[in-house]
Interface confidence: low
């Protein structure tokens, strides 16, 4: 048999120790047993229905879940903190008859050096500090325990862990004398698990790191991690995958190239390249192993570590999106887009497509859009007809069907789903844009005009008159 | 510092058992696993088990599962292990060891172990 | 059970000499989670074994920079690349991917 300790010996799932998946007890809720399928294969939809339905209509007898608010608890173990000291935490809400847990991993860009850390923690302390934090949380999108705004997991166990490590969930350094700052994102998360492994994460049978933005790269740094750190701490049975949203950047070359002053203006690759020196950062083994030293930074990029991780990872992307433009020092500041810059905007969207290829499990509309898990109208957005909570039901199907060793995709299941059409908001659903100066409303044509696309040019590959594209974006088609 | 202390020598009859001591000092018990290696005098080293302290789990080498029986104590950081129905063959050295991030990075110095009537 | 074959046996050298140890494995020892947890100790007279490279190539802390580790799947190898004095003793490899975990027999390193 194979090994299944610490971080050598994560083998094959033996049987359970004795704390780890006992049955329940007398009157304890069981969340999950065997369903045969295969009778309502052909009417999966509305079998889903049905259930939904039926989920909804018991859903008032919880009283449990009456209280949407996710509650703070700082960590006991006080050496691990946020940017200035102080401790690090987490907020819980409960589920005491499920055994999933979603832990969701905050973003909020970094800092990495000494200047844009003093002045991050002026302008932003929430993202460095914990001293005022509030006592809870209100659990939004798939952070939501009702069914109708979370049909993927609304009865999870929800965990908030909130960033204030400013080191892309990175980081192993504490503060001392010599350093202002401490760095512990990579240690937050292990302390958390530690610390929910008392609360009932033990008895777990998938956890789900999420995350958003650097929480997304957070997620794909730390998601093997976290899985080795279950069997090393006994619990090899729980079954550990990522799900990063906006979270998957390019080091592409910058539209306009600028010095690395500050946060926004820094190449990617050369923000990163500091900040890993600065936090102490530490990536993937599997990923560290593939480049040199001093070259760890490749590692916080999705297309290059992603090939590396063990465990599954759903990633989720918009193809045009916000915090990469912006990186790439692309302002959208109303005035007509110039011919170079709608080109190199398409581009990105085809290079982003590109890197998804070979990711099986991926949901990229073709929006200029930042982040997507948590707003409470994540259920909107379709790709190819699929929103991302169906998206991700049919990657729980096939992660629960692969022991049959079938490779193909489940009949009306998709998981892979990326936008084929080539400009912003050319997916009629995306989530509606706003004049940045007037707020006003914008539908996808008067957005594309503003931008300065060119209907004739926009219409042109697709075999339309510029009026017919029109009529068709208008009507949301 | 890390350390892990063994008492040097044990002395027992044909047919008796054991319970040899580690006592783990300089860092946190509970997350790290302790291995057990034999060594019998002019021989290598052979893996026995290991135990995590953290939640009770245990791997045996299927060769000594009837023989020993690992088990530890948290509140004062201490592993064991219990060897039963002891035999010549059983004269041995016997190593703890703490397994740290994949390695078996510390040692005890050892218990020598004599079988003798 | 996975058995770790180390040869030589003995290995006399000269001191500032270049030595080198071979571990073969009897399966490959890749781990599932792609790791390789192959590992050399260091066993000198009347002393415990002490860590010398962890996953095959990595120096635990403290080693000099001499002891040096390569190989895969099935094949390892352990070089000291200027034999000193406190270098003398026997060397062990060692496989914690599968278990039960294994030793090699030992290999010897003496004096010319």
């Known amino acids: 048999s194979e090994g299944r300790k610490t971080w050598r010996r994560r083998g094959q799932q033996p049987p359970p120790p004795p704390r780890t998946e006992a049955a329940p007890a007398a009157g304890q809720p069981v969340e999950s047993f065997p369903l045969d399928f295969t009778a309502v294969e052909g009417n999966m939809d509305s079998f889903m229905a049905q259930v939904k339905s039926l989920a909804q209509s018991l859903y008032p007898c919880s009283a449990q879940q009456l209280n949407e608010d996710l509650r703070l608890h700082l960590l006991l173990n006080t050496s691990v903190t946020c940017n200035d000291g102080s401790p690090a935490g987490y907020y819980l809400k409960e589920s005491r008859g499920s055994r999933r847990w979603l832990l969701f991993l905050e973003g909020g860009w970094y800092c990495f050096n000494r200047e844009n850390c003093d002045s991050r923690y002026d302008t932003m302390r929430r993202l460095m500090s914990s001293r005022d934090w509030p006592r809870t949380r209100t659990g939004t999108g798939i952070l939501s325990s009702q069914p109708e705004e979370n049909p993927y997991w609304w009865n999870a166990n929800m965990v908030f862990i909130p960033y204030c490590s400013s080191d892309v969930w990175s980081g192993a350094s504490s503060k001392s004398e010599k350093n202002e700052y401490a760095f512990m994102g990579a240690l937050i998360i292990q302390e958390v698990v530690r610390e929910l492994l008392g609360r009932g994460l033990s008895g777990a049978k998938v956890l789900l790191l999420a995350g958003s933005s650097a929480g997304g790269t957070g997620v794909l740094l730390n998601v093997d991690r976290v899985a080795e750190q279950l069997e090393k701490l006994g619990y090899p049975a729980i079954q550990v995958r990522g799900l990063a949203d906006s979270g998957w950047f390019l080091d592409n070359k910058q539209y306009r190239h600028t010095d690395c002053v500050d946060t926004i203006t820094c190449a990617p690759t050369e923000a990163i390249r500091r900040g890993i020196r600065y936090w102490n950062g530490v990536v993937p083994e599997r990923c560290r192993r593939q480049f040199q030293e001093g070259e760890e930074w490749n590692c916080f990029f999705g297309y290059k570590v992603y090939p590396t991780l063990r465990c599954p990872v759903f990633v989720v992307q918009w193809l045009f999106d916000e915090a990469q433009l912006t990186v790439d020092n692309v302002h959208l500041t109303g005035q007509p887009v110039q011919e170079g810059l709608r080109l190199y905007i398409q581009n990105l969207g085809r290079e982003l497509r590109h890197t998804l290829k070979d990711v099986p499990a991926s949901f990229a509309p073709a929006c200029l859009s930042h982040e997507i898990i948590i707003r409470s109208h994540w259920t909107d957005v379709q790709v190819k007809g699929t929103s991302l909570p169906r998206a991700l039901h049919c990657w729980d199907r096939s992660l629960h069907d692969s022991h049959k060793a079938s490779k193909t995709p489940l009949k009306g299941c998709p998981v892979h789903l990326v936008d084929s059409c080539p400009w912003p908001h050319c997916n009629p659903s995306c989530p509606t844009v706003r004049d940045q100066f007037t707020g006003q409303e914008m539908n996808v044509a008067q957005f594309l005009m503003h931008m300065g696309f060119d209907m004739q040019t926009v219409a042109q590959p697709q075999g339309l008159e510029p009026s017919e594209l029109l009529g068709m974006l208008s009507n949301g088609s | 510092q890390v350390q892990l202390q063994q008492p040097g020598a044990e002395l027992v009859k044909p047919g008796a058992s054991v319970k040899m001591s580690c006592k783990a000092s300089?860092?946190?018990?509970?997350?790290?696993?302790i291995s057990w290696v034999k060594q019998r005098p002019g021989q290598g080293l052979e893996w026995i088990g290991d135990?995590?302290?953290?939640?009770?789990?245990?791997d045996y080498n299927e060769k000594f599962k009837t023989k020993a029986t690992l088990t530890v104590d948290t509140s004062s950081s201490t592993a064991y292990m219990q060897l039963s129905s002891l035999t010549s063959e059983d004269s041995a050295v016997y190593y703890c060891?703490?397994?740290?991030?994949?390695?078996?990075?510390?040692w005890g110095q050892g218990t020598t172990l004599t079988v003798s009537s | 059970d996975v058995l770790m074959t180390q040869t030589p046996l003995s290995l006399p050298v000269s001191l500032g000499d270049q030595a080198s140890i071979s571990c073969r494995s009897s399966q490959n020892i890749v781990h599932s989670n792609g790791n390789t947890y192959l590992e050399w100790y260091l066993q000198k007279p009347g002393q415990s074994p002490k860590l010398l490279i962890y996953?095959?190539?990595n120096r635990f802390s403290g080693v000099p920079d001499r002891f040096s580790g390569s190989g895969s799947g099935t094949d390892f190898t352990l070089k000291i690349s200027r034999v000193e004095a406190e270098d003398l003793g026997v060397y062990y490899c060692f496989q914690g991917s599968h278990v039960p975990y294994t030793f090699g027999g030992g290999t010897k390193l003496e004096i010319k």
């Open positions: 996953k095959v190539s």
């Open positions: 135990f995590y302290p953290g939640s009770g789990r245990t």
């Open positions: 300089g860092y946190t018990f509970t997350r790290y696993w």
């Open positions: 060891s703490r397994d740290g991030h994949g390695e078996g990075d510390y």
